[in-house]
C-alpha cells in the first residue's frame, strides 16, 4: 500500500490521543534504555510503511502484536485516514485469522514495540515539512 495520500495530521492526532497510551501500557515495566532503536524511516509515508510492517507482520519471536489494542487502533486510523487502505487489508486479515495464536508478550515483542515508538515519534515530527 502507498501511504502517500493519507491524512497525516489526522493519523498523528489519533496516535497522540490514544495509540501512544496503549503502547505505553504494553511497555509498562520496561526501561527506556533496554532496547536500541535500529529501525528508522525517512519521511511520513515511509514511516507508516515501517509502522504497518512492524505492527501487523509476524516476525521471528513475536507473532502476536496484531491483536493488541494499539494495533487495532492503528489499523482503524489507517483505514479511516488512508484512502483505499481497508481494501488492501482484506486478504491480509483473512490470512492472519488462520494463524492466530495465544497472546504472549515476549522480550522480542517488547523490543519491536520499542522500535514502533521510535517510528511513531519520527512520523509525528518530521523536521522537513514537505514530508
Amino acid at each position: 500500500y502507498d501511504f502517500t495520500n493519507c491524512d497525516f495530521e489526522k493519523i498523528k492526532a489519533a496516535y497522540l490521543s490514544t495509540i501512544s497510551k496503549d503502547l505505553i501500557t504494553y511497555m509498562s515495566g520496561t526501561k527506556s534504555t533496554e532496547f536500541n532503536n535500529t529501525v528508522s524511516c525517512s519521511n511520513r509515508p515511509h514511516c507508516l510503511t515501517e509502522i504497518q510492517s512492524l505492527t501487523f507482520n509476524p516476525t521471528a519471536g513475536c507473532a502476536s502484536l496484531a491483536k493488541e489494542m494499539f494495533a487495532m487502533k492503528t489499523k482503524a486510523a489507517l483505514a479511516i485516514w488512508c484512502p483505499g487502505y481497508s481494501e488492501t487489508q482484506i486478504n491480509a486479515t483473512q490470512a492472519m485469522k488462520k494463524r492466530r495464536k495465544r497472546k504472549v508478550t515476549t522480550n522480542k515483542c517488547l523490543e519491536q514495540v520499542s522500535q514502533l515508538q521510535g517510528l511513531w515519534r519520527r512520523f509525528n515530527r518530521p523536521l522537513l515539512k514537505q514530508q
Partner: antibody, heavy 120, light 111 residues
Framework: EVQLVQSGAEVKKPGSSVKVSCKAS????????MHWVRQAPGQGLEWIGA????????SYNQKFKDRATLTVDKSTRTAYMELSSLRSEDTAVYYC?????????????WGQGTTVTVSS | DIVLTQSPATLSLSPGERATLSCRAS??????????MHWYQQKPGQPPRLLLY???NLGSGIPARFSGSGSGTDFTLTISSLEPEDFAVYYC?????????FGQGTKLEIK
C-alpha cells in the same frame, strides 16, 4: 533517566566560530529530535534549529540558516551546534533540548546551558 | 512566522493569590483538534522546565495548582494558589508551524 551535559563556557572574538557540544546519557538517542535554543542576557528564548540523529536531517530557523551548523556523532551520543561569523549580539546562553517521547514538540529534557561571550 | 504575545509582561502578586497568564498567537496553533501550545517555567541561572504540554496537560512532576486552557489563538496558564517557588519567568511555545517560536515571557514577581 535521560541527561544532557553541555560543554563549558566560551569567550570568542567577533568574526570567529564556536562549537558547543551536548552529550546524552540514558535513554535512546537516535530517534529523538534534538533542538538548540539560545537566550541572550535578560532576554527570551530563541529557537536555532533541530537535528534528527537517526539520519542527520536538520531544520533551521531562517535567521540562523547561513551561520549555524548542527551535527551529531551517534557513536558518542553527542550533538553539536557550531555558530560562525560571531558578533556581539550572539552573546547568550545556548541550550540543547530533547524533544518529547511522542513527537508532540515540547522539550522535556534540557542541557544545563553553555555561556558564549563574544567580545573584542 | 507565528508570533506569540504574552501578557502581562510582569505580574506582581503575593503568595496564596491566583495567577492568570495569557499567550496569544498570531494564527491558530491547532491541528486536527489538538492545540500544539506548550508552557515552561524558568528560574534565574536554570534552563526552562516544562509545565504544560498541548495547552492543558501537566508535565511530569508538575503540581496540580498549575493548569492550562485555550485553543486556536488564545491560551491561558493559571496557578491557583501561588507558592514562593512559583515566582519565575513563564514562556509559551508553539510547534504547529515552523519555525518553532516562543513568547517573550511573563515575569511573575512577589508583590
Amino acid at each position: 533517566e535521560v541527561q544532557l551535559v553541555q560543554s563549558g563556557a566560551e569567550v570568542k572574538k567577533p568574526g570567529s566560530s564556536v562549537k558547543v557540544s551536548c552529550k546524552a546519557s540514558g535513554g535512546t538517542f537516535s530517534t529523538y529530535n534534538m533542538h538548540w535554543v539560545r537566550q541572550a542576557p535578560g532576554q527570551g528564548l530563541e529557537w536555532i534549529g533541530a537535528i534528527y540523529p537517526g539520519n542527520g536531517e536538520t531544520s533551521y530557523n531562517q535567521k540562523f540558516k547561513d551561520r549555524a551548523t548542527l551535527t551529531v556523532d551517534k557513536s558518542t551520543r553527542t550533538a553539536y551546534m557550531e555558530l560562525s561569523s560571531l558578533r556581539s549580539e550572539d552573546t547568550a546562553v545556548y541550550y540543547c533540548a530533547r524533544e518529547d517521547d511522542y513527537g508532540e514538540g515540547y522539550f522535556d529534557v534540557w542541557g544545563q546551558g553553555t555561556t558564549v561571550t563574544v567580545s573584542s | 512566522d507565528i508570533v506569540l504575545t504574552q501578557s502581562p509582561a510582569t505580574l506582581s502578586l503575593s503568595p496564596g493569590e491566583r495567577a492568570t497568564l495569557s499567550c496569544r498567537a498570531s494564527e491558530s496553533v491547532d491541528n486536527s483538534g489538538l492545540s500544539f501550545m506548550h508552557w515552561y517555567q524558568q528560574k534565574p541561572g536554570q534552563p526552562p522546565r516544562l509545565l504544560l504540554y498541548r495547552a492543558s496537560n501537566l508535565g511530569s512532576g508538575i503540581p496540580a495548582r498549575f493548569s492550562g486552557s485555550g485553543s486556536g489563538t488564545d491560551f491561558t496558564l493559571t496557578i491557583s494558589s501561588l507558592e514562593p517557588e512559583d515566582f519565575a519567568v513563564y514562556y509559551c511555545q508553539q510547534i504547529n508551524t515552523d519555525p518553532l517560536t516562543f513568547g517573550q515571557g511573563t515575569k511573575l514577581e512577589i508583590k
